[in-house]
């Protein structure tokens, strides 16, 4: 997260880190005791999932292996549409005040809505500085019409933009797949943006979760 702040401890109990060994690979969001939602571009063969701590590499955090993941069947490595994936944990999470599932959206929030994005991604760009603490940034949803002025045809119908006018605050390397939460519901998953990160008036681009609720529910049901 560029130009963000340290999240209030315990305020993001649904935030997970997808690790490759002990190294951060992507963010993710707990949606069920067996399931984590993340970006399709975060796919790996297997994952170590850290839950229940704001500190990356915390020894006291829950760590659960995941060997199965399900990309949206329409994910395109060319256009990056449908950049969403479910990761099935090998064993269920122990729910607590520190580990909770996020609320999936009932509706799509409108432009102008205030949201928070979080992650352990680099706080500087292009040179990287990875924080140990979970970082947050407060951003507002931007209309597709406004966002297309920046990204033109790169912006797909199920992509969502968020940012703050004239501000550098944005997501960056390592934040991928992490949550954009608006009014206590999951509205976005970090997908992409311009580089170096934090260029004012270049919004962050997210997968618009409200458009995928049916796919999420059906996929979890199918692979129970």
């Amino acid at each position: 997260i560029i130009d963000g702040y340290k999240c209030k401890e315990g305020s993001h109990p649904w935030q997970v880190a997808l690790l490759k060994g002990n190294q951060l690979h992507c963010g993710g969001v707990l949606v069920d005791k067996y399931w984590v939602l993340t970006a399709a571009h975060c796919k790996m063969g297997q994952y170590q999932v850290q839950l229940g701590s704001d500190k990356i590499g915390d020894q006291s955090a829950q760590k659960i292996k995941a060997t199965k993941s399900f990309r949206h069947p329409g994910y395109s490595t060319k256009t990056h549409v449908n950049d969403i994936m479910l990761v099935r944990l090998d064993e269920p999470v122990k729910m607590s005040s520190k580990v909770e599932a996020v609320q999936l959206p009932e509706h799509c929030e409108p432009p102008g809505t205030s949201c928070t994005v979080s992650g352990w991604g680099t706080t500087t760009s292009p040179d990287v500085t990875f924080p140990s603490d979970l970082m947050c940034s407060d951003v507002k949803l931007i209309s597709s019409r406004e966002c297309k002025k920046v990204y033109k045809d790169l912006l797909g119908k199920t992509m969502l933009c968020a940012g703050i006018p004239d501000s550098k605050t944005n997501t960056c390397n390592g934040d991928s797949g992490g949550p954009l939460v608006c009014n206590d519901t999951l509205q976005g998953l970090v997908s992409w943006g311009t580089y170096p990160c934090g260029q004012p008036n270049d919004p962050g681009v997210y997968t618009q979760v409200c458009k995928y609720k049916r796919w999420v529910m059906e996929t979890m049901k199918t692979h129970r």
Epitope: H25, K78, K152, D153, N173, S176, T194
Partner: antibody, heavy 122, light 108 residues
Framework: QVQLVQSGAEVKKPGASVKVSCKAS????????IHWVRQAPGQGLEWMGS????????NYAQELQGRVTMTTDTSTSTAYMELRSLRSDDTAVYYC???????????????WGQGTMVTVSS | DIQMTQSPSSLSASVGDRVTITCRAS??????LNWYQQKPGKAPKLLIY???SLQSGVPSRFSGSGSGTDFTLTISSLQPEDFATYYC??????????FGGGTKVEIK
């Protein structure tokens, strides 16, 4: 230091295969994609394809589809490009390059290997 | 696929000259165009990304401009070490990534 180091020059006969390696160091290999670009003698640059080091997702240039395979070995931070059924017009310098960006999209090549000369001759 | 056309294909110039190279895309690529410098026997080196942003460590005599389909690389005062071949590429509609044909800058 941040670098990509490629394997040495190769001389191959028409119809044979070649496998070029590209070892990354100084950065997190699995967080970036590796692209391959070639340059025939006295000619311009030609994009061949790319691979995501973490997912193994590949995209190949249409004209090379079926002849080229890109792979990675994350344990050694090495990318490989294999080209089969070699022809004389495959004679070129082959470069690996890192694409800079984050998340699903990348925007430019900020790091290149030194190049590997592949000569196809009978 | 988007075609990138560079012009001129070669030019002769003297040290201290102002040099301009153009790159035209077959359709709009917004500002997702980059410029590279390549010297004989060496790998290309990034000069400009996003049409106008100077890569770290590149001298300020290099500048880029343009958006949509027409782009320009300018060297404000040519130095001896600038004699090389210059390429543009587009990262807008990818894959494939497409390069311009190159412009060779030679000593007059």
């Amino acid at each position: 230091q941040v670098q990509l180091v490629q394997s040495g020059a190769e001389v191959k006969k028409p119809g044979a295969s070649v496998k070029v390696s590209c070892k990354a160091s100084g950065y997190t290999f699995t967080s970036e994609g590796i692209h391959w670009v070639r340059q025939a003698p006295g000619q311009g640059l030609e994009w061949m394809g790319s691979i995501s080091a973490s997912s193994g997702d590949t995209n190949y240039a249409q004209e090379l589809q079926g002849r080229v395979t890109m792979t990675t070995d994350t344990s050694t931070s090495t990318a490989y490009m294999e080209l089969r059924s070699l022809r004389s017009d495959d004679t070129a310098v082959y470069y690996c390059a890192r694409a800079a960006g984050y998340g699903a999209r990348h925007w430019y090549f900020d790091l290149w290997g030194q190049g590997t000369m592949v000569t196809v001759s009978s | 696929d988007i075609q990138m056309t560079q012009s001129p294909s070669s030019l002769s110039a003297s040290v201290g000259d102002r040099v301009t190279i153009t790159c035209r895309a077959s359709q709009s690529i917004s500002s997702y165009l980059n410029w590279y410098q390549q010297k004989p026997g060496k790998a290309p080196k990034l000069l400009i990304y996003g049409a106008s942003s100077l890569q770290s460590g590149v001298p300020s005599r290099f500048s880029g401009s343009g958006s949509g389909t027409d782009f320009t690389l300018t060297i404000s005062s040519l130095q001896p070490e600038d004699f090389a071949t210059y390429y543009c590429d587009q990262f807008y509609s990818t894959p494939p990534i497409t390069f311009g044909g190159g412009t060779k800058v030679e000593i007059k």
